[in-house]
């Protein structure tokens, strides 16, 4: 059966300056390939976090993604600003040159509330 990407929350609300967690779990590690988070869809979507590299300011993984059995690819966004509003997608890729997108979560819309 094909891997499923589960984003349980359809939306979350967060006050500006606070942190929010965007949840994502996979049903399988296979097929092998990276997991990335994007805001938006299509050509203009913005890479928010990749589990293959470090150095994403304000965004961290929630669980220990270095566990070999890890299926939790949730992220935490800190010090949220109004510009962070939008719909976030957890996306599974299959290894290749280049990697191929094979499954996306349903998306979680982030609403940023004024403080």
């Amino acid at each position: 059966t094909e891997v499923k990407v589960i984003q349980p929350e359809k939306s979350v609300s967060v006050a500006a300056g606070d942190s929010t967690v965007l949840n994502c779990t996979l049903t399988s590690l296979l097929p092998v390939g990276p997991i990335r988070w994007y805001r938006g869809v299509g050509q203009s979507r913005q890479l928010i976090y990749s589990f293959t590299t470090e150095h994403f300011p304000r965004v961290t993984n929630v669980s220990d993604a270095t566990k070999r059995s890890n299926l939790d690819f949730s992220i935490r966004i800190s010090n949220v600003t109004p510009e962070d509003a939008g719909t976030y997608y957890c996306v599974k890729f299959q290894r290749g040159s280049p990697d191929t997108e094979i499954q996306s979560g349903g998306g979680t819309e982030v609403y940023v509330l004024a403080k």
């Epitope: 590690l29 097929p31 092998v32 293959t52 590299t53 270095t66 566990k67 070999r68």
Partner: antibody
Framework: DVQLVESGGAVVRPGETLRLSCTAS????????MSWVRQAPGKGLEWVSG????????YYADSVKGRSTISRDNSKNTLYLRMSSLTAEDTAVYYC???????????WGLGTLVTLSS | ALTQPASVSANPGETVKITCSGG?????YGWYQQKSPGSAPVTLI????KRPSDIPSRFSGSASGSTATLTITGVQAEDEAVYYC???????????FGAGTTLTVL
């Protein structure tokens, strides 16, 4: 620069116990899974054990399972491997290696030599 | 176990390809260079085709299905070494290595 420095290698007798250490610098140690890889004289590389970044999950090759314990102290940037019931087959250079996101290796230490001698 | 040729040889400037098979489609591959026994391995390639920034561009990697290939374009005398392929299998959580390929530069 990433640096991994192993220590603790020694000449030991069969049946004894040894603890190897690997001190890391130049990167955020607590963010990376780590592994031990060994190389017996005249032989190829053999993965021995791995540990997740938090230290909660550990993994072992069949050849050492049940008599080895991998651990880490993130406050000291140090990785450990405790090996008991040592045999001649454990004679090797032991390397610590930093894991990539998909559990391959990107940086290696210089190694520490473990020699079994009766 | 991963399978790679025991030895290859080439003249300076030639292109060398070393293959590694047996990991299956649930594996990622890496390539490691060891210039002398007991010396520290150096990672040339990880994640099938990712080259660390300090590795010369003449080293490249690729993978198709369950076979990985290390290509050295314009081999140099200093490339004489043993090359190990390594794999990580997502179904067993285990790392494996090939037996190593000795590259001789004629």
């Amino acid at each position: 620069d990433v640096q991994l420095v192993e220590s603790g290698g020694a000449v030991v007798r069969p049946g004894e116990t040894l603890r190897l250490s690997c001190t890391a610098s130049g990167f955020t140690f607590s963010s990376y899974a780590m592994s031990w890889v060994r190389q017996a004289p005249g032989k190829g590389l053999e993965w021995v054990s791995g540990i997740s970044a938090s230290g909660s999950d550990t993994y072992y090759a069949d050849s050492v399972k049940g008599r080895s314990t991998i651990s880490r102290d993130n406050s000291k940037n140090t990785l450990y491997l405790r090996m008991s019931s040592l045999t001649a087959e454990d004679t090797a250079v032991y390397y610590c290696a930093r894991e990539t996101w998909n559990h391959l290796f990107d940086y290696w230490g210089l190694g520490t030599l473990v020699t079994l001698s009766s | 176990a991963l399978t790679q040729p025991a030895s290859v040889s080439a003249n300076p400037g030639e292109t060398v390809k070393i293959t590694c098979s047996g990991g299956g489609t649930s594996s990622y591959y890496g390539w490691y260079q060891q210039k002398s026994p007991g010396s520290a391995p150096v990672t040339l390639i990880h994640s099938d085709d990712k080259r660390p920034s300090d590795i010369p561009s003449r080293f490249s990697g690729s993978a198709s299905g369950s076979t990985a290939t290390l290509t050295i374009t314009g081999v140099q005398a200093e490339d004489e070494a043993v090359y190990y392929c390594g794999g990580y299998d997502y179904t067993t959580y285990v790392n494996t290595f090939g037996a190593g390929t000795t590259l001789t530069v004629l």
